[in-house]
């Protein structure tokens, strides 16, 4: 069946209406060779644009080719020239350009200061309980539940870094075993990629931009999961991460040395320590059942105090308690012993806005998940804007060729490697794998990097990451330097293994496969996306960890038939796309299943009822919103929303209501369901209120 | 200042029982450990037992152990010692005195009471 | 039980002079040690605690020393209210214990 013609414009000027319009066609010179390797397996989808109502559309010829919503799309210098400005206009420019980048630094900036508060926000609102979480006796014996443990840990305190120190001090003061420690790690590293994952959802407004970004950030979800799919087995039955590591930290006579360079948090921390500071410790002493933590504040108040050590007549239960019988006496009812009491004197209180409140680290929690979600937000759609206005024509041009191209015939292959390198380079440099991926999600909604380029720069950064805690164990006191050590060898080679697995050979490059699937579901189906993050990150993990708490034979007779069903269906799934006539009839498609268990299109409507009723007053928001950013930036049309709320108005103006024409549109990207009908998708199944 | 007022004298029969006590002020009663002690003139200083006001609890000499129950009444800053089944032998001065907190010395004494078995 | 013994039960002295009691523990006690002073007709009256020392209001010419199951009490420049029983008693243990006493009368 033929695609979708394009619509055209009957205006002579088509870039004076159709703004964006541009923007959606493929770079087809520019496309890279990894692009071009991967993208067979995708599903031929088309665009078309509705065009203001004032336009006149004609039908323009089919192209030849199917448009590839993965290819970059390209960015359209709207403006003059620099061989055309006069002096003036060129000196403006550089100014304009100045400007543009010191904003750009700024809300960088602000972006990685949020992201910083936000794991601060989530370790006030979730910390205590992922604390209690470690202290559950019941990792020793079951590596899944060290696995969720891991996970959901991280994903409550928005942090690898302190689950993985929590694991090293459990492990340095013998509660934990290495051995039981690595599941754990391999949960961390899972659960700190969804930070990137909520970062991607800041793209939503933009479907082509969503696509990319989200596809973008899961593809380090699905090299984590696959990795953890394989390599954990592994673990369990060879041991080797364990093995491998405890060799290294044997051969080397290490002695603690200086602390790991700070680097971006030399910058940041000015800011962050005014907003609010923790005591990060009280999660460590409640994972290693300190019942006193339990009703300490995470909130840090006193940032100056002075510690002495005294000793002190303190009361034992019996003599037995002693540490030698002349160092005890009796009061004649209790027994008295003497000992080293570390004393702490508070001298300066902490200067963040938190301190003399006295919230509750809930209220504290709220408040800032709240601020650091909006500044995020914020931060994000003003980068995007910047980056849009300042990657244009050449600009743009040089950039995604430097980045998106391989190297000449035969060292192609070496460019991947190399991203792997900058990517670990880059995350060294920001002490964080965090900030370094969710600072690549806008790039790559925008299209300045492919997600075949993403992927090794991901990669690198999980690598980064283990070197940063690699230095930093080998910072550590001589009581936890071992332990430390082997942990974050355990990740650092957990990490190299997963790479091993996924990145070599193309074909095994499952995760950019994975992800863009997850992509074209999220930006057909936008809430899917949050459901995505909940299924992935909270369900499966929570019912992983109820079910290992009721024992392993619970856990085995829910496990297996899940498991097994997931196995056939993916079989299945494979036959009906590879070879389809070795299956009967009715299994060469899922049709023989209700349509809700084979296609999102009836959830999309349940779904579509809830959030209707918030659609309205949200639309109402963004379109105020855009007024006043287009005031505040003087041009008349900086500012879009969403397709969901064009589509809305277009609902309104059907039954009589007006509304003013919005000026530009997103694309609609019609899915091999649409395919079968030539219709414009309607509004209740394309659109949600996300 | 702290002062530990005793009665001077109690004079009981044979098998009987006797409550003594000692009425405490110029200090925070239910800090202290209350200690009793036994002083005759064969014997030397013996000590019964102690009480802490704070929480009721108490300690004692083996030799003591079902002989002396010491009490203490936060309402009134009193301790009391009940001596039961008295024979001759208990014919002795019984001695309060304040423990000093956080070790069993003993810095302020009761005057004592003289308590004579006789029929 | 640990048995507090005091070797001599009278020292006799004249004013100015220096005396030296001992107090021998039965097993090691630290220096969980007290003196009293017991005049006759009185009450005792704390003078020394953790073996050395003084209890307040007490005059300097007392002192305390030893440690583990040799203690001694001295009193360096005797005077005549001095005269009296002094007792050691160890608090190392339940049951607190005393030694016999030792009287201290004037030549």
């Known amino acids: 069946m033929a695609p979708w013609p394009e619509l055209g414009d009957a205006q002579p000027n088509p870039s004076k209406y159709l703004e964006g319009a541009t923007s959606q066609q493929p770079i087809t010179p520019d496309k890279s060779k990894e692009t071009n390797k991967t993208d067979n397996t995708e599903v031929p989808v088309t665009k078309f644009e509705l065009l203001p109502t004032y336009s006149t559309a004609t039908l323009i010829e089919e192209p030849t080719e199917v448009d590839d919503p993965w290819n970059l799309p390209t960015l359209q210098d709207s403006g003059i020239k620099w061989s055309e400005r006069d002096a003036k206009g060129k000196i403006l420019c550089v100014f304009q350009g100045i400007g543009r980048l010191i904003l750009l630094l700024g809300f960088l900036y602000f972006f990685v200061c949020s992201l910083d508060v936000l794991s601060s926000a989530f370790q006030l609102v979730g910390g205590k309980m992922a604390g209690q979480f470690f202290s559950n006796s019941s990792i020793m014996s079951n590596p899944l539940l060290g696995l969720v443990i891991g996970v959901l840990v991280t994903v409550f305190v928005q942090s690898s870094s302190t689950s993985t120190s929590i694991v090293v001090s459990m492990v340095a003061s013998s509660l934990l075993t290495v051995r039981a420690a690595i599941p754990i790690i391999m949960g961390a590293n899972i659960g700190t990629s969804i930070t990137n994952t909520i970062v991607a959802l800041m793209q939503v407004g933009d479907r082509s931009e969503f696509r990319r970004a989200f596809a973008g950030a899961t593809v380090h979800d699905f090299f984590n999961w696959l990795s953890v799919l394989v390599l954990l087995p592994v673990e369990v039955a060879t041991h080797y991460l364990e093995v491998v590591t405890q060799l290294i930290v044997e051969s080397f006579h290490f002695k603690n040395g200086e602390d790991a360079p700070d680097l971006l948090k030399v910058i940041t921390k000015p800011f962050t320590k005014l907003i609010v500071q923790l005591d990060k410790k009280v999660i460590s002493q409640i994972a290693m059942n300190d019942e006193t933590a339990k009703n300490k504040s995470l909130v840090k108040i006193w940032c100056k105090t002075f510690t002495n050590m005294t000793q002190m007549n303190v009361t034992v239960p019996s003599m037995a308690n002693c540490t030698s019988h002349s160092l005890c006496w009796t009061d004649g009812i209790q027994i008295w012993t003497m000992k080293n009491v570390t004393y702490k004197e508070n001298i300066a209180k902490c200067q963040h806005i938190f301190v003399n409140f006295h919230l509750p680290d809930l209220a504290v929690g709220i408040i800032l998940l709240i601020i650091s979600l909006l500044v995020l937000c914020g931060c994000l759609i003003m980068i995007v804007k910047i980056l849009g206005s300042v990657l244009k024509g050449q600009v743009a041009t040089v950039i995604k060729k430097t980045i998106n191209t391989d190297f000449p015939f035969p060292f192609a292959w070496l460019t991947g490697y190399l991203a792997i390198l900058v990517g670990a380079g880059m995350t060294f440099i920001v002490q964080s794998s965090s900030v370094f991926t969710s600072a690549l999600t806008p790039l790559i909604g925008i299209g300045v990097i492919t997600i075949e380029r993403a992927y090794p720069l991901t990669l690198g950064s999980n690598i980064g990451t283990t070197t940063t805690a690699i230095l930093a164990a080998l910072a550590s006191p001589g009581n936890t330097l071992r332990s430390s050590l082997q942990i974050a060898l355990c990740h650092f080679f957990f990490n190299i293994s997963g790479i091993l697995l996924w990145y070599p050979i193309p074909f095994t490059r499952l995760p950019i496969r994975m992800a863009k699937g997850l992509g074209n579901i999220s930006a057909k189906y936008r809430w899917f996306a949050v459901f995505y993050l909940i299924i992935f990150f909270f369900l499966i993990p929570l019912t992983v960890f109820g079910l290992s708490l009721a024992g392993w034979p619970v856990l085995v007779g829910v496990g297996v038939p899940v498991v097994f069903i997931i196995i056939l269906v993916l079989c299945l799934r494979l036959l009906q796309s590879r070879c389809p006539r070795v299956l009967p009839k009715k299994l060469q498609n899922w049709n023989f299943l209700p349509l809700c268990m084979h296609s999102l299109k009836p959830w999309d409507a349940v779904i579509s009822k809830f959030t209707g009723p918030f659609q309205m007053p949200c639309c109402c928001c963004c379109r105020v919103c855009c007024r006043v950013c287009c005031l505040l930036c003087g041009c008349p049309k900086c500012c879009r929303c969403s397709k969901c709320c064009q589509d809305l108005e277009e609902g309104q103006e059907a039954q009589g209501v007006p509304v003013k024409a919005p000026e530009t549109f997103d694309n609609i990207t019609i899915s091999r369901e649409a395919q079968g009908e030539v219709r414009a998708p309607d509004s209740k199944t394309e659109c949600t209120a996300l | 200042q702290v002062q530990l007022q005793q009665p001077g004298a109690e004079l009981v029969k044979p098998g009987a029982s006797v409550k003594m006590s000692c009425k405490t002020s110029?200090?925070?009663?239910?800090?202290?450990?209350m200690h009793w002690v036994k002083q005759t003139p064969g014997q030397g200083l013996e000590w019964i037992g102690a009480?802490?006001?704070?929480?009721?609890?108490?300690a004692y000499n083996q030799k003591f152990k079902g002989k002396a129950t010491l009490t203490a009444d936060k309402s009134s800053s009193t301790a009391y010692m009940q001596l039961s089944s008295l024979t001759s032998e208990a014919s002795a001065v019984y001695y309060c005195?304040?423990?000093?907190?956080?070790?069993?010395?003993?810095?302020?004494w009761g005057q004592g009471t003289s308590v004579i078995v006789s029929s | 039980d640990i048995v507090m013994t005091q070797s001599h039960k009278f020292m006799s002295r004249s004013v100015g002079d220096r005396v030296r009691i001992t107090c021998k523990a039965s097993?090691?006690?630290?220096?969980?040690v007290a003196w009293y002073q017991q005049k006759p007709g009185q009450s005792p009256k704390l003078l020394i605690y953790?073996?050395?020392t003084r209890h307040s209001g007490v005059p300097d010419r007392f002192t305390g020393s030893g440690s583990g199951t040799d203690f001694i009490f001295t009193i360096s420049n005797v005077q005549s209210e001095d005269l009296a029983d002094y007792f050691c008693?160890?608090?190392?243990?339940?049951?607190?214990?005393f030694g016999a006493g030792t009287k201290l009368e004037l030549k």
């Open positions: 005195a304040r423990g000093m907190y956080g070790h069993g010395a003993m810095d302020y």
């Open positions: 110029g200090y925070t009663f239910t800090t202290n450990n």
């Open positions: 009480i802490y006001p704070g929480n009721g609890a108490t």
């Open positions: 097993q090691d006690v630290g220096t969980a």
């Open positions: 953790w073996a050395t």
């Open positions: 008693q160890q608090y190392s243990s339940n049951p607190l214990t």
